[in-house]
């Protein structure tokens, strides 16, 4: 169903062109937190990082997972830990940084062939494209040549964040990928659940701006998982 699509964390596992150049560190092509800067939050430094208590992965930032800070430690004391880069050991998808997933105990790059069929099947079922075929989405995001001569303004279609003007990133918005503003403090952000690729996220938000990370709104702890809001908060 569309709800399961929206509540999944397929973004980090999408093949190009949907999720940008997955698995290529430094490629500024993403639409969501963590994809733009695989392997860690660009804005998060060791100096200002404060351990954030958590009970589950989705309470952490996009480039983090929830676990005990010490191996074999007390499961009741868990904090958000930095995600693991490619070739590092893992026990579940959430432990791996965006653009990677856990396979046979190792974080490996999300590979186009692994997910394309599943994504197309999900999106076709959910949206029932009226007058066109999917063709791996390349048809949906092909740009007018004009896009390459001037930076895209808010709401204009894009392929990657570099197509957009300063302060904007390229993010899916229902039907298309468009230039959206980088998020400010207090604005709603998307926290990807990173449980593997179980469909395509129809919407994407930009990442949180400098000095901010996407965390669960404290007054929403009692709400159900699917309705809890995450906002950009100071580290």
């Amino acid at each position: 169903t569309l709800n399961s699509v929206l509540n999944s964390n397929a973004i980090k596992n999408l093949p190009p062109p949907l999720g940008g150049a997955a698995g290529h560190p430094g490629s500024a092509v993403s639409a969501a937190p963590g994809i733009l800067y695989p392997g860690g939050n660009k804005y998060q430094t060791i100096d200002n990082y404060q351990p954030y208590p958590c009970a589950e992965d989705e309470e952490c930032g996009t480039d983090e997972y929830c676990a005990s800070p010490t191996r074999g430690g007390d499961a009741g004391v868990q904090i958000c830990l930095a995600c693991r880069k490619r070739r590092k050991r893992c026990m579940r998808h959430a432990m791996c940084c965006p653009g990677n997933y856990c396979k046979n105990g190792i974080c490996v790059s999300s590979d186009q062939n692994n997910f394309r069929g599943e994504i197309e099947e999900t999106i076709t079922e959910s949206f029932g494209n009226d007058h066109s075929t999917l063709d791996g989405y390349s048809r949906r995001t092909t740009l007018s040549s004009k896009m390459y001569h001037s930076k895209g303004q808010e709401g204009s279609v894009c392929l990657r964040s570099s197509d957009c003007a300063t302060g904007l990133c390229c993010a899916r918005h229902f039907w298309s990928k468009i230039c959206k503003p980088v998020l400010k403090e207090g604005q709603v952000c998307t926290k990807h659940r990173r449980k593997g690729s179980h469909g395509l996220e129809i919407f994407q938000r930009c990442y949180c701006g400098e000095g901010l990370s996407c965390r669960i709104q404290k007054d929403h702890h009692q709400a159900s998982n699917s309705s809890r809001l995450h906002t950009c908060q100071r580290h």
Epitope: S132, R140, S144, G155, I178, V188, F203, S226
Partner: antibody, heavy 118, light 112 residues
């Protein structure tokens, strides 16, 4: 500034046809998805259709109430959006707005009134 | 059919704050952390006031704010002014055939 100007509305009999146009200016038309939204007299807003930024073979979506009767299209060389309405019914009577679909419907035209009546 | 439910009318005095609710289901508003709000003055086209739950487009007063909890979204207008008197519509996305859904609209009256 962004400007959208609809035209083509008027009185038409049930079962008849009408073609609405929307002339766009002030932005790169070919870089935006575009929609039609309508509003029956004294009623709320109802989304009608949307079309991809490309004008040849682009993706289109329709509300269930108009699917099979209405066709959305665009001509990027003319910066114009169209809505071909066939088999019109009394319940299609409304002001039809052309809207730019950027981050949601971020710019709207002034609307054109379509009256379906015998 | 109106997919999202809004109160038909709300009112407030200048300077006060008012909140307009918008209730949907898990198939639309509740299934997305995306909701937009539009302002429409009589005889005019709608204007986007809030998108993505709580984001304001440039040029929209910071007196307008949005929030969402579960299947209900809210638009709050603080420091009510006479020019705020208008109809307000919420909008979300939905699964199924109707991919875009609007609320039935709320008429805001600024008293006095």
């Amino acid at each position: 500034q962004v400007q959208l100007v609809e035209s083509g509305g008027g009185l038409v009999q049930p079962g008849g046809s009408l073609r609405l146009s929307c002339a766009a200016s002030g932005f790169t038309f070919s870089s935006y998805w575009m929609s039609w939204v309508r509003q029956a007299p004294g009623k709320g807003l109802e989304w009608v259709s949307v079309i991809e930024h490309k004008d040849k073979g682009g993706t289109t979506y329709y509300a269930a109430s108009v699917k099979g009767r209405f066709t959305i299209s665009r001509d990027n060389s003319k910066n114009t959006l169209y809505l071909q309405m066939n088999s019109l019914r009394a319940e299609d009577t409304a002001v039809y707005y052309c809207a730019r679909h950027g981050i949601d419907f971020d710019h709207w035209g002034q609307g054109t009134l379509v009256t379906v009546s015998s | 059919d109106i997919a999202l439910t809004q109160p038909a009318s709300v009112s407030g005095s200048p300077g006060q704050s008012i909140t307009i609710s918008c209730t949907g289901t898990s198939s639309d508003l509740g299934g997305y952390n995306y909701v937009s709000w539009y302002q429409q003055h009589p005889g005019k086209a709608p204007k986007l006031m809030i998108y993505d739950v709580n984001n304001r487009p440039s040029g929209v007063s910071n007196r307008f704010s949005g929030s969402k909890s579960g299947n209900t979204a809210s638009l709050t207008i603080s420091g009510l002014q006479a020019e705020d008197e208008a109809d307000y519509y919420c909008q979300s996305y939905a699964s199924g055939n109707t991919k875009v859904v609007f609320g039935g609209g709320t008429k805001l009256t600024v008293l006095g």
